[in-house]
Amino acid sequence: MDSFNYTTPDYGHYDDKDTLDLNTPVDKTSNTLRVPDILALVIFAVVFLVGVLGNALVVWVTAFEAKRTINAIWFLNLAVADFLSCLALPILFTSIVQHHHWPFGGAACSILPSLILLNMYASILLLATISADRFLLVFKPIWCQNFRGAGLAWIACAVAWGLALLLTIPSFLYRVVREEYFPPKVLCGVDYSHDKRRERAVAIVRLVLGFLWPLLTLTICYTFILLRTWSRRATRSTKTLKVVVAVVASFFIFWLPYQVTGIMMSFLEPSSPTFLLLKKLDSLCVSFAYINCCINPIIYVVAGQGFQGRLRKSLPSLLRNVLTEESVVRESKSFTRSTVDTMAQKTQAV
């Protein structure tokens, strides 16, 4: 790919006009970034700093406990998914700074922007797995005592990752670099060209499997868990449940704009004014979705402070307290049904 003359371009950004004056020279330039892009850059910067440090800390805290603590396995996998996505941020940041120019080649175009979708599917599948675990702890404690183990947890995580990779393939396959003639720019994006139906299908599958279906099932799941918890007057466990609900709710809140704009764009003509407006907001929607990659460590710290009253402990020990405390089911073989029902909620965050 040739390098471009960015320093002194004779041509810049143009206001489209319907008329064509063939004798009008076109030496007009504009190098300012749009407001949505500036906001996206700010969010990317914050997410990268908090996400890399926060998730690295979570990985460090949970990795040592993952052999014996099931909660640690869940949090380790979630943190790895978030951490991986954060690694793409410097590249995405650079691209936006260069007015969406993509100088990183075709392979990077296929892989790096797909990481956020891999994160979305991995996160929601892991959240679903964790929610199923919590549900079983509350409603099937005897089964949990007999079968709930680290091996099964790792298998569940492996299945979640496998499905996530599978669901990310369409985005990966349709990502291409397109070198625009003017303004001279290489763009990284999806190109379905002749197949608008396939584009819509991918967007619908993403909306249903990555958002609507999990939203429905997790809402039902946590409604049952909350009702059971409250009916047992488990005040301690409701605090932890707030962490769980916060993580799940944040997922849906931060993915909502991306999903809505994505489905709308798939049904609109690329030259329509609404499509162009949504396209201008695309980076902002992606950056908003990326907040998911740094929000969990923040939730854990806030929760940890809540449980400790004050932040007296060091950050790693605080996180360890929130993330690796195992449910009563695995700690004691002698228990009553009501004990499990109320106490199993303890630090089963997410």
Epitope: P25, V26, D27, E180, Y192
Partner: antibody
């Protein structure tokens, strides 16, 4: 009015080099990019590349990257294309064309009359 | 590279009749600014190509209204409603959205 006057027909041997010229008049030369297009006998058009006369920045079709070299002379408002290591495949009519448009240089609005390059031993 | 496929390669017409030329691109020609840079040129025998239509459907001044362009994304059409003798020649579609700029193979409009 705008005119692009190209040099006359060229006859060259395989392996040799030729330099085709395109003299512009009737407009400000440095304000418009100049493109070059190849047309083999009875065939379609192939884009070779363009040059920005203001900065002398040239952009090439990868296919012609080692074949063509685009230059300009601002004082004489002339664009040049040098073709090197000629083969029989280079036998064609070569056009220079000016681009314009209100939102960018997207359209070939004026074309030269074409220069026929014959490669023969 | 974007491949521009023109059909038919030869189109016999009667004077006063209608002609329709199709042009299909291998990739979407919608630019990131929302415009579609698909243009049409006419080349008469022994002459340089002449600019007719820009951005799918916009005629340049001096081009009669019997010429009309349409289409979007990857499929485009040039229609000539009442063919006159001066319309005969080779019609090329061209895209200037992506590098390298590419042209169709051409459609020869000739008398039946």
């Amino acid at each position: 009015q705008v005119q692009l006057q190209q040099s006359g027909a060229e006859l060259a041997k395989p392996g040799a080099s030729v330099k085709l010229s395109c003299k512009a008049s009737g407009y400000t030369f440095i304000s418009y990019w100049m493109h070059w297009v190849k047309q083999r006998p009875g065939q379609g058009l192939e884009w070779i590349g363009y040059i920005n006369p203001r900065s002398d920045y040239a952009k090439y079709n990868q296919k012609f990257k080692d074949k063509a070299t685009l230059t300009t002379n601002k004082s004489s408002s002339t664009a040049y294309m040098q073709l090197s290591s000629l083969t029989y495949e280079d036998y064609a009519v070569y056009y220079c064309a000016r681009v314009t448009g209100t939102e960018g240089p997207y359209y070939f609005d004026y074309w030269g009359q074409g220069t026929t390059l014959t490669v023969s031993s | 590279d974007v491949v521009m496929t023109q059909t038919p390669l030869s189109l016999p017409v009667s004077l006063g009749g209608q002609a329709s030329i199709s042009c299909r691109s291998s990739q979407s020609l919608v630019h990131s600014n929302g415009n579609t840079y698909l243009h049409w040129y006419l080349q008469k025998p022994g002459q340089s190509p002449k600019f007719l239509i820009y951005k799918v459907s916009n005629r340049i001044s001096g081009v009669p209204d019997r010429f009309s362009g349409s289409g979007s994304g990857t499929d485009f059409t040039l229609k000539i409603s009442r063919v006159e003798a001066e319309d005969l020649g080779v019609y090329f579609c061209s895209q200037s959205t992506l590098v390298p700029l590419t042209f169709g193979a051409g459609t020869k409009l000739e008398l039946r």
